[in-house]
Interface confidence: medium
């Protein structure tokens, strides 16, 4: 059964863009006019979870690729990864928990909390060219993003 999908570019609150740096890693960096088209476009699917006034369960795929952000436990720490999926089966309204994020809108910004690991968020570092990761909102890490809609 088809599910609702919208397409977005994400930038962190420092205006760093997200780019695919190798087959399975996202990095955050500032892009200028010439290479702005390097930033990834996310396919946001509205999936199984518990929606509320301030949280909407979504899955985040990379448009045109069979890759989804997922959250898994590695060496005792919740970890963000890009996971390859079967394009015949994904996206679906009932995604495995590791693919589900609670999209939380805070003023004009948005945060993405792991459904599998509450209080862990998609995060970027202050520094340039660092991987996007799953953080627990500590220190200087950035968890607030802006979403730019992209026509399908």
């Amino acid at each position: 059964v088809p599910i609702r999908q919208l397409h977005y570019r994400l930038r962190d609150e420092q205006q760093k863009s997200l780019v695919l740096s190798d087959p399975y890693e996202l990095k955050a960096l500032h892009l200028n006019g010439q290479n702005i088209n390097q930033q990834v476009i996310f396919s946001m699917s509205f999936v199984q979870g518990e929606p509320s006034n301030d949280k909407i369960p979504v899955a985040l795929g990379l448009k045109g690729k069979n890759l989804y952000l997922s959250c898994v436990m590695k060496d005792g720490t919740p970890t963000l990864q890009l996971e390859s999926v079967d394009p015949k089966q994904y996206p679906k309204k009932k995604m495995e928990k590791r693919f589900v994020f609670n999209k939380i809108e805070v003023k004009s910004k948005v945060e993405f909390e792991s459904a599998e690991f509450p209080n862990w968020y998609i995060s970027t570092s202050q520094a340039e060219h660092k991987p996007v990761f799953l953080g627990n909102n500590s220190g200087q890490d950035i968890i607030d993003f802006t979403m730019e809609s992209v026509s399908s």
């Epitope: 059964v1 088809p2 509205f46 199984q48 979870g49 518990e50 929606p51 089966q89 679906k92 928990k97």
Partner: antibody
Framework: QVQLQQWGAGLLKPSETLSLTCAVY????????WSWIRQPPGKGLEWIGE???????NYNPSLKSRVTISVDTSRNQFSLSLSSVTAADTAVYYC?????????????WGQGTLVTVSS | QSVLTQPPSVSVSPGQTASITCSGD??????AFWYQQKPGQSPVLVIY???KRPSGIPERFSGSNSGNTATLTISGTQALDEADYYC?????????FGGGTKLTVLG
């Protein structure tokens, strides 16, 4: 308050086609998925399939070749058709709503219709 | 096709805690749901998304799900909790119910 009211023939002969309809009263029709489930006498529940308002369907693989679920949005109704029935299809058939607010699970059910297949 | 396995029956004394299990391959990767069904009635959702309670369901009902097992726990079990309980999950695009557990409240 949401209500699901279902009806259809209760007694069939082997090889006939089972037809049931479920009407939805209260609440939006387009925001949900609509499902059919059955329960043979004294046994457990079996999911048959689902449909959304646009007519997109999902079926249980074990029944897929015999099942058709359709929707009539103008009447807020959806229907089940099961062809070539046998005694093994004797069951109480339920219609139900799958809601996003409960994680796309079945939160409202019809009253059930007992369908008996007998020669 | 996925299989969800439940014990056929569980007995508990009034006021005690009843635990009903549901096992399936990597069930903890998915969301589990629980339904209560009394004789002659349609099923009623009692737990959704592993551990959430719909409005109107008493606090004594709780759920958990990890590894290969989801568990429905009824604390302070009452006579009116006597019923069949079904777990429910999904496999790829289709839904799967467990075989059901008959909960008997003794006495």
């Amino acid at each position: 308050q949401v209500q699901l009211q279902q009806w259809g023939a209760g007694l069939l002969k082997p090889s006939e086609t089972l037809s049931l309809t479920c009407a939805v009263y209260g609440g939006s029709f387009s925001d949900y998925y609509w499902s059919w489930i059955r329960q043979p006498p004294g046994k457990g529940l079996e999911w048959i399939g689902e449909i959304d308002h646009s007519g997109s369907t999902n079926y249980n693989p074990s029944l897929k070749s015999r099942v058709t679920i359709s929707v009539d949005t103008s009447r807020n109704q959806f229907s089940l058709s099961l062809s070539s029935v046998t005694a093994a299809d004797t069951a109480v058939y339920y219609c139900a709503r799958a809601s996003p607010s409960s994680g796309w699970t079945l939160d409202y059910w019809g009253q059930g219709t007992l369908v008996t297949v007998s020669s | 096709q996925s299989v969800l396995t439940q014990p056929p029956s569980v007995s508990v004394s009034p006021g005690q805690t009843a635990s009903i299990t549901c096992s399936g391959d990597k069930l903890g990767d998915k969301f589990a749901f629980w339904y209560q069904q009394k004789p002659g009635q349609s099923p009623v959702l009692v737990i959704y998304l592993d551990n959430k309670r719909p409005s109107g369901i008493p606090e004594r009902f709780s759920g958990s799900n990890s590894g290969n097992t989801a568990t429905l726990t009824i604390s302070g079990t009452q006579a009116l909790d006597e019923a069949d309980y079904y777990c429910y999950a999904w496999d790829n695009a289709y839904e799967v119910f467990g075989g059901g557990t008959k909960l008997t409240v003794l006495g």
